[in-house]
């Protein structure tokens, strides 16, 4: 699998999409996990509804939400109030029993907000009561890493 880069702006929402063959993964729940190290395990962040027929319902874990269009074959993950610590490698997965198929490998990059000149202490963090439905979702910038490309070029 190639890695697809999704870039979002700090403090805003980032939408990650993972297309898949809807028939190949028919009846399969999906998950979004964070890769722990290059060869480490992928730690589950959030998964779709326990009942596959209800996969279209949004499920959330903290600031991350997931929804699955099982007919169209698109898994969508929304990372709300994007923070620098959200940057890293992730996977979209299709689940069956104890097994997980990788649908897409994702690198999330968090960009500083060019319009935000406030101190970090003044950053607005939304309250738990605010729903994902109200969240403003920016269109994410995505591209695939080229063969052999270093995801985080060394800084001088």
């Amino acid at each position: 699998h190639n890695t697809t880069v999704f870039q979002g702006v700090e403090g805003q929402s980032l939408q990650v999409s993972c297309p898949y063959d809807s028939m190949k993964h028919w009846g399969r729940r999906k998950a979004w996990c964070r890769q722990l190290g290059e060869k480490g395990p992928c730690q589950r962040v959030v998964s779709t509804h326990n009942l596959w027929l209800l996969s279209f319902l949004r499920r959330r874990n903290g600031s991350t939400a997931i929804t699955d269009d099982t007919l169209g074959g698109t898994l969508t993950i929304t990372l709300r109030n994007l923070q620098p610590h959200d940057a890293g490698f992730y996977q979209c997965q299709s689940l069956h029993g104890s097994e997980a198929d990788t649908l897409r490998k994702v690198l999330v990059e968090v960009l500083a907000d060019p319009l935000d000149h406030r101190d970090a202490g003044d950053l607005w963090v939304p309250g738990e009561s605010e729903s994902f439905e109200d969240a403003h979702v920016e269109h994410s910038i995505s591209r695939s890493l080229l063969e052999g490309e270093i995801p985080f070029p060394p800084t001088s």
């Epitope: 063959d21 028939m23 190949k24 993964h25 028919w26 009846g27 399969r28 009942l51 596959w52 027929l53 069956h96 029993g97 104890s98 097994e99």
Partner: antibody, heavy 121, light 107 residues
Framework: EVQLVQSGAEVKKPGESLMISCKGS????????IGWVRQMPGKGLEWMGI????????RYSPSFQGQVTISADKSISTAYLQWSSLKASDTAMYFC??????????????WGQGTLVTVSS | EIVMTQSPATLSVSPGERATLSCRAS??????LAWFQQKPGQAPRLLIY???TRATGIPARFSVSGSGTEFTLTISSLQSEDFAFYYC?????????FGPGTKVDIK
């Protein structure tokens, strides 16, 4: 009628190559995984591997990895099981089966009639 | 890989009697378990999938109980066409694995 029809019995010598086939009809062949199962004479069933003809994604059971090759040609709705160098221990009945996925679980619901492969010098 | 065991290896039953076949997994397979019937010279036939769902055309005399590691296939009243080999298959973990089978023969 939904069915899988396998190629006929084969008699081969050790070291020879062989490809047997499994043709699907009556359903969308590209949308279902096809599995291969071995049954040695007088023995039980052994899972060999599986292929998704839509994109040729193939998975092998560790016991059969490197021993056989599973492939498919979706244009003619046919899956294949291939050996590059047969051994006497490959003598068995080989079945292909369709895997249907669903919300209540997966099911090998349609089976081919089997292909008997005999390897003898 | 998960090892499946079936007992007994052979079950001798009279027609009309009840037959109880056991399938045990070396670790939990949740409900990802299927049962197949095979007669000599024929391909296997799907009976049960998802631990307890009967396949199309399978009569109600076939039922399964259990989940996790222990499953039981019950044939409530054996008919002449039920004398055959029965195999369980787990596909919770890769690779999927079959049990060694139980032969149900006429007493």
């Amino acid at each position: 009628e939904v069915q899988l029809v396998q190629s006929g019995a084969e008699v081969k010598k050790p070291g020879e190559s062989l490809m047997i086939s499994c043709k699907g009809s009556g359903y969308s062949f590209t949308n279902y995984w096809i599995g291969w199962v071995r049954q040695m004479p007088g023995k039980g069933l052994e899972w060999m591997g599986i292929i998704y003809p839509g994109d040729s994604d193939t998975r092998y059971s560790p016991s059969f990895q490197g021993q056989v090759t599973i492939s498919a040609d979706k244009s003619i709705s046919t899956a294949y099981l291939q050996w590059s160098s047969l051994k006497a221990s490959d003598t068995a009945m080989y079945f292909c089966a369709r895997r249907r996925q669903g919300i209540w679980g997966d099911a090998l619901d349609i089976w081919g009639q089997g292909t008997l492969v005999t390897v003898s010098s | 890989e998960i090892v499946m065991t079936q007992s007994p290896a052979t079950l001798s039953v009279s027609p009309g009697e009840r037959a109880t076949l056991s399938c045990r997994a070396s670790q939990s397979v949740s409900s990802n378990l299927a049962w197949f019937q095979q007669k000599p010279g024929q391909a296997p036939r799907l009976l049960i999938y998802g631990a307890s769902t009967r396949a199309t055309g399978i009569p109600a005399r076939f039922s399964v109980s259990g989940s996790g590691t222990e499953f039981t296939l019950t044939i409530s009243s054996l008919q002449s066409e039920d004398f055959a080999f029965y195999y369980c298959l787990q596909d919770n973990n890769w690779p999927p694995t079959f049990g060694p089978g139980t032969k149900v023969d006429i007493k």
